[in-house]
Every structure is written in structure tokens, then in C-alpha cells.
Interface confidence: medium
């Protein structure tokens, strides 16, 4: 559960996150598992640890192996493992399966291809996009933030898409590429009002002060690929990013398609080190699509430790 596969290409930057989470204040130590040798934190090193992140700037084939991260708090340690494989650059255009990130599907109405792992890096727009090694050109292709939008998708648009960007670390630039397959499927779905499955309206969630808490906003929007469907959290009527509390972050969950074909989305709100003042906030789960916008509100209450033991 707490082991994660990561891969990259030699001479490119690779940044790996520890699969175990902790508060920002916790220290994280990294080791090379085979030798139990500590990974340095000084940035002058080619491979160095930076809190929850392990940075290879740039990566080398010899860096392949299992790395251990230990999240240390005053009361406990948590251990995670990062299985890192660095591959030689291919001379031909084919991207082997082992370098591919998860496949995404699109349709005539929905054609977003997200650049995998990009959120780990310090990058600036624009992204460069390639399909089967050819740079994408023409007005049908639009690089927008961390994703590519293809207008009027056709079956011929299926293929392997590579995003390329520059990671900047202390003034030095490193190239990063990531590839995923894009498949085109026929639009045979329908769209309906957002149905928020979780949380329940006006739900009270019990949390423990000092512990971490997760709230999941989950909504379904119809069957098949949706042209517009989004879920997110609001804090006291404010965007999470504008709220300015680094302990509280939202993280996109998995796009879900259940056995009944319903298209659903999750957004997880992670609250690290729950504080008393968090109990005073209003947490709004919002779901939007072409039909309308729905909101469910959650509040936190203190879990009585005695309940926890019973």
C-alpha cells in the first residue's frame, strides 16, 4: 500500500513524492534501501531530498532502485517506499509500455489530456505537446495550463501524447517528458443534474484535534463522457487556494465510471493537523455541469476521544 512505482528518463528531472503523508512540520528522511545510505538534503547534490520530495536533477540509469522515506513525528514514524526506475532514452520514436502513464479517454465533446505528474514540478507555461513524436500544430490543439484540449476530436486523434516541460530548480533548468495514451470513444452517454453522493447535505463530520482529516466531495453527472463536469471544495465561500491555509489542500480523486456507466468525480479535501478553528469553518462541496450547480455543506465537530476507544 505504501509503495509507489516511479519512472523517468536519464538526463531528465525526476521528482518523487513519499507515499506516506504527514504534516508539513514533520521531518522526512530518505534512504537508498539497498545500502541504507541516507540521501543528502543539500541542493548541490544531483540527487537530494527536500521534505516529502526526492529529486533527481537530472536522473541517471544508476539511480534505479528502491528508496525508503520515513516520516518522523514526535510520537510515531511512518515508512514508505518509492520504487524508482530510470530508463535510457530511446533512439526511435516508440514509447515503450513501461514509460506510459495511465490511458485517458476522450470523445468529440471532451478531449482533455492532462500532463502526468506535472504538479510535482516547478514549471512555467506553456507546455509542449507531441503526438507520436510529432510536435502538435494547428488551431485544433490548445495547451491550457497543465492539459491539452483537442477541438473536434476524431478517431484519428487516438495515439500516444507526450508533454514536455522545463523544471526550474535554483535557476537551473531540467527537461521533463511524460507520455500517456489517448483513446477516442463514441459518445453514447447522457448528462443529468449533478448528483452529490457525498457528503450528505449539512453533514457533521467528527474529527480529532491534531490528527489529519479527509473530506470527499463525490458527484455523478450522467453516463459516458461529460463535456463539462467538475467538483471542488470551498472554504467559507472562498476558493481553497485563496483561503491561504497551507494545512488545507484539495486533491483530485479518480474519475470514476461505475459498472452502471455513471460518470462520477471525486475531490478530496485534506486537512493536516486539525485545529480548533477548523471547526468554525463551513466546507462546501460544489458540483457543476451544463445543467447547473449544486452545493452540499459540511461542518466539522470534535470527536470525543472516549468514543474513539469504545
Amino acid at each position: 500500500k505504501f509503495s509507489k512505482q516511479s519512472w523517468g528518463l536519464e538526463n531528465e528531472a525526476l521528482i518523487v513524492r513519499c507515499p506516506r503523508q504527514g504534516k508539513p512540520s514533520y521531518t522526512v528522511d530518505w534512504y537508498y534501501s539497498q545500502t541504507n545510505k541516507s540521501i543528502p538534503t543539500q541542493e548541490r547534490n544531483r540527487v537530494f531530498a527536500s521534505g516529502q520530495l526526492l529529486k533527481f536533477l537530472p536522473a541517471a540509469v544508476a539511480d534505479s532502485g528502491i528508496y525508503t522515506c520515513i516520516v518522523r513525528s514526535p510520537t510515531f514514524n511512518r515508512t514508505g517506499y518509492a520504487n524508482v526506475t530510470i530508463y535510457k532514452k530511446q533512439s526511435d520514436c516508440n514509447v515503450p509500455d513501461y514509460l506510459m502513464y495511465s490511458t485517458v479517454s476522450g470523445s468529440e465533446k471532451n478531449s482533455k489530456i492532462y500532463c502526468p505528474t506535472i504538479d510535482l514540478y516547478n514549471w512555467t507555461a506553456p507546455l509542449e505537446w507531441f503526438k507520436n513524436c510529432q510536435a502538435l500544430q494547428g488551431s485544433r490543439y490548445r495547451a491550457h495550463k497543465s492539459f491539452l484540449v483537442i477541438d473536434n476530436v476524431m478517431t484519428e486523434d487516438a495515439g500516444d501524447y507526450t508533454c514536455k516541460f522545463i523544471h526550474n530548480e535554483n535557476g537551473a533548468n531540467y527537461s521533463v517528458t511524460a507520455t500517456r495514451s489517448f483513446t477516442v470513444k463514441d459518445e453514447q452517454g447522457f448528462s443529468l443534474f449533478p448528483v452529490i453522493g457525498a457528503p450528505a447535505q449539512n453533514e457533521i463530520k467528527e474529527v480529532e484535534i491534531g490528527k489529519n482529516a479527509n473530506l470527499t466531495c463525490s458527484a455523478c453527472f450522467g453516463k459516458g463522457t461529460q463535456f463539462l463536469a467538475a467538483v471542488l471544495w470551498q472554504l467559507n465561500g472562498t476558493k481553497i487556494t485563496d483561503f491561504g491555509e497551507p494545512r488545507i489542500q484539495q486533491e483530485e480523486g479518480q474519475n470514476q465510471s461505475f459498472s452502471n456507466g455513471l460518470a462520477c468525480l471525486d475531490m478530496v479535501l485534506r486537512i493536516a493537523d486539525v485545529k480548533e478553528e477548523d471547526l468554525l469553518l463551513q466546507y462546501d462541496c460544489l458540483a457543476l455541469n451544463l445543467h447547473g450547480l449544486r452545493r452540499h455543506t459540511v461542518r466539522l465537530s470534535r470527536k470525543n476521544p472516549i468514543d474513539h476507544h469504545s
Epitope: 447535505q201 463539462l228 467538475a230 465561500g237 476558493k239 485563496d242 460544489l286 445543467h291 447547473g292 450547480l293
Partner: antibody
Framework: QVQLVQSGAEVKKPGSSVKVSCKAS????????VNWVRQAPGQGLEWMGG????????NYAQKFQGRVTITADESTSTAYMELSSLRSEDTAVYYC?????????????WGRGTLVTVSS | DIVMTQSPDSLAVSLGERATINCKSS????????????LAWYQQKPGQPPKLLIY???IRGSGVPDRFSGSGSGTDFTLTISSLQAEDVAVYYC?????????FGQGTKVEIK
């Protein structure tokens, strides 16, 4: 006190486009929703569409789909509504409006309106 | 699209008397999960933009006098002016925000008798 300040009146030829701006004076559009509502002379109110900056996306009334584009530039706190392929029946006062909740449901703050006249 | 139908189209009421405007939606605007009616009322005076009076069917907007009240649920809603004042002469609109496209009623003109 936030005010929505709209661009001035426009006279346009049929087939052309118009772009109306709406600036949030004394505030911003960050985390807000800006909607556009029009009112033809002597007629009622008609919702054209809205941009919910929280989601970074716009929704449009089917009637205007393909002809209207609503955008917002958070750096200048300005929202825009562009209507193309103008016809005489597009002659109206165009209002931008926003709401306190930032979700574009109901509108508690309105611009003073921009009169767009389409005439050959 | 949800069609909003107001009645009457116009209304003449004596100063100090009660004015009642009805609004009917072609489908329910009640979101049962939250028990909220996605309905607002506006007042518009000649040459001015509309002003929000009521939202969530019954909550008064900021600075709106308490003689204005909203009621109703599902498909049938009412705006009541308990004691009409001269400054209340205007056109009143209901609006649903349950479903995109958001739609307005055709308006009700309130005059003094």
C-alpha cells in the same frame, strides 16, 4: 464598495461582433461568478450565460451557444462578453451581474448596462 | 428550459395596501437534498438595472425593507409587499437558478391605484 463598471454604448452593423467589458471597481473577480443578462427595449430579462471563476468555466444559454463568449481576466478584474453574428433583434441593454456567493445563481450586484444597437 | 410564468402582468394597488405577485415554474426548483428553492425576486425601476430583493425563495437581500417577503416551494412562489410605498412602483421579476439556462418570469408591473 464594489461596483461593476461597464463599457460604453455601441452601434454595430448586422453580421458584426460586439465585445462589452465589465470591470469590478474596488474589488476583483477572483472566486466570483460573472453573468450576462440582456434586456431588449420594453422587454423582460434574458440570461445569456455566466463564467464561474471558481471552476474556470463558462455556461451559456443554448439560444446563444456558438455566438457568445464570456471570459474574465482576474489580473484586471474585468469580465467580457462577446456576441458575434449580430442581428437587429440583438439590440438591447446588456448587463453584467454577480452574486455574493460567487456561484452565479442569483445576482445582487449589477452593472449599469451597455446599450448595443444593431442597425444597418 | 424551465419556463417561469408570473401573474398578474400588471397590478394597481393603493398606497399602504398589500401587493401580491405570483410566480409559477414549469418544473420544481426545489433541490430536495438541501431543501432549498432555487428562486430569486428582483425589482427594476425605469432606466435602472434590476435590484435583488429575495433569494432562496424567502431570504431578503441586503438593505431590502422588511415589507418585502418571499414564500412558496416547489413550483409556486409569491412575492408580497405588505404595505405599498410610492418608491415600490417598478417591474418585478422572478428568476430560477435551479437549472441552466437560468430563466426569468416575464415581469409584473406594479402601479399605484
Amino acid at each position: 464598495q464594489v461596483q461593476l463598471v461597464q463599457s460604453g454604448a455601441e452601434v454595430k452593423k448586422p453580421g458584426s461582433s460586439v465585445k462589452v467589458s465589465c470591470k469590478a471597481s474596488g474589488g476583483s473577480f477572483s472566486g466570483q461568478a460573472v453573468n450576462w443578462v440582456r434586456q431588449a427595449p420594453g422587454q423582460g430579462l434574458e440570461w445569456m450565460g455566466g463564467f464561474v471563476s471558481l471552476f474556470g468555466t463558462a455556461n451559456y444559454a443554448q439560444k446563444f451557444q456558438g455566438r457568445v463568449t464570456i471570459t474574465a481576466d482576474e489580473s484586471t478584474s474585468t469580465a467580457y462578453m462577446e456576441l458575434s453574428s449580430l442581428r437587429s433583434e440583438d439590440t438591447a441593454v446588456y448587463y453584467c451581474a454577480r452574486d455574493r456567493e460567487g456561484l452565479g445563481w442569483y445576482f445582487d450586484l449589477w452593472g449599469r448596462g451597455t446599450l448595443v444597437t444593431v442597425s444597418s | 428550459d424551465i419556463v417561469m410564468t408570473q401573474s398578474p402582468d400588471s397590478l394597481a394597488v393603493s398606497l399602504g395596501e398589500r401587493a401580491t405577485i405570483n410566480c409559477k415554474s414549469s418544473q420544481s426548483v426545489l433541490y430536495s437534498s438541501s431543501n432549498e428553492n432555487y428562486l430569486a425576486w428582483y425589482q427594476q425601476k425605469p432606466g435602472q438595472p434590476p435590484k435583488l430583493l429575495i433569494y432562496w425563495a424567502s431570504i431578503r437581500g441586503s438593505g431590502v425593507p422588511d415589507r418585502f417577503s418571499g414564500s412558496g416551494s416547489g413550483t409556486d412562489f409569491t412575492l408580497t409587499i405588505s404595505s405599498l410605498q410610492a418608491e415600490d412602483v417598478a417591474v418585478y421579476y422572478c428568476q430560477q437558478y435551479y437549472s441552466i439556462p437560468y430563466t426569468f418570469g416575464q415581469g409584473t408591473k406594479v402601479e399605484i391605484k
